[in-house]
């Protein structure tokens, strides 16, 4: 799912406030709902029937600094009988999400929202079949 | 979406060699994992190799020793340098890959046939 355009009216202060110069201002990098946490069901991504592996990136310059990926194992899905069934596709499956970016210029640091694509599983889908004219 | 072409197939003596392409295009798509399949007249489709984006390879039983899968990811094509051949290689061999496509709506990953190229094996 697109994640909807960050638009300046977003950042924009009321009008009854003065404008900040160079567009710059503050922002808390503390967690709201901090300690909530999403539980993967045990082994989901070996018991799918598109399995996948996850590989952890980690940036020094961005926050969050780690950010986990999935890579589909099989091209195929797996079948009842665990064999991989080439009829089907292992599939990524994206999400689109914002990270800062911490810009180093001289001794000054800035930060930047960034988009990132986070693949977070793999899912199994009929392929599509295109058809000479 | 991203459309698959097959080519390089033919009739080759036994004990020949052959090597099939299958060129990837589209507007902004990264091609992944990908695969050559192939289906022998009357018979199930059948694995014969995959390249995974990071170049990791498979090989069917039958395949092995004899097949090589490759890419060349600047040019957005898949080979399979085939030796050794034997009359029960003789099928319709098809390129499937996974994809991931940019287009208007946002990014999405799908997967991709083409429509396969005749490779046979007889004297």
């Known amino acids: 799912r697109k994640i909807p355009k960050v638009g300046h009216t977003f950042f924009q202060k009321p009008e009854s406030c003065p404008p900040v110069p160079g567009g710059s201002m503050k922002l808390d990098i503390g967690i709201i709902n901090e300690n909530q946490r999403v539980s993967m069901s045990r082994n989901i991504e070996s018991r799918s029937t598109s399995p996948w592996n996850y590989t952890v990136t980690w940036d020094p310059n961005r926050y969050p600094s780690e950010v986990v990926q999935a890579q589909c194992r099989n091209l195929g899905c797996i079948n009842a009988q665990g064999k991989e069934d080439i009829s089907m596709n292992s599939v990524p499956i994206q999400q689109e999400t914002l990270v800062v970016r911490r810009k180093h210029q001289g001794c000054s640091v800035s930060f930047q929202l960034e988009k990132v694509l986070v693949t977070v599983g793999c899912t199994c889908v009929t392929p599509v079949i295109h058809h000479v004219q | 979406e991203v459309q698959l072409v097959e080519s390089g197939g033919g009739l080759v003596q036994p004990g020949g060699s052959l090597r099939l392409s299958c060129a990837a295009s589209g507007r902004d798509f990264r091609v992944k994992n990908v695969g050559w399949i192939r289906q022998a007249p009357g018979k199930q489709r059948e694995l014969v190799a995959t390249?995974?984006?990071?170049?990791?390879?498979n090989y069917a039983d039958s395949a092995k020793g004899r097949f090589t899968i490759s890419r060349d990811n600047a040019k957005n094509t898949v080979y399979l340098q085939m030796s050794s051949l034997k009359p029960e290689d003789t099928a319709v061999y098809y390129c499937n890959a996974v994809a991931t496509v940019t287009d208007y709506t946002g990014t999405y990953s799908d997967g991709f046939w083409g429509q396969g190229t005749q490779v046979t094996v007889s004297s």
């Open positions: 390249i995974t984006v990071g170049g990791s390879t």
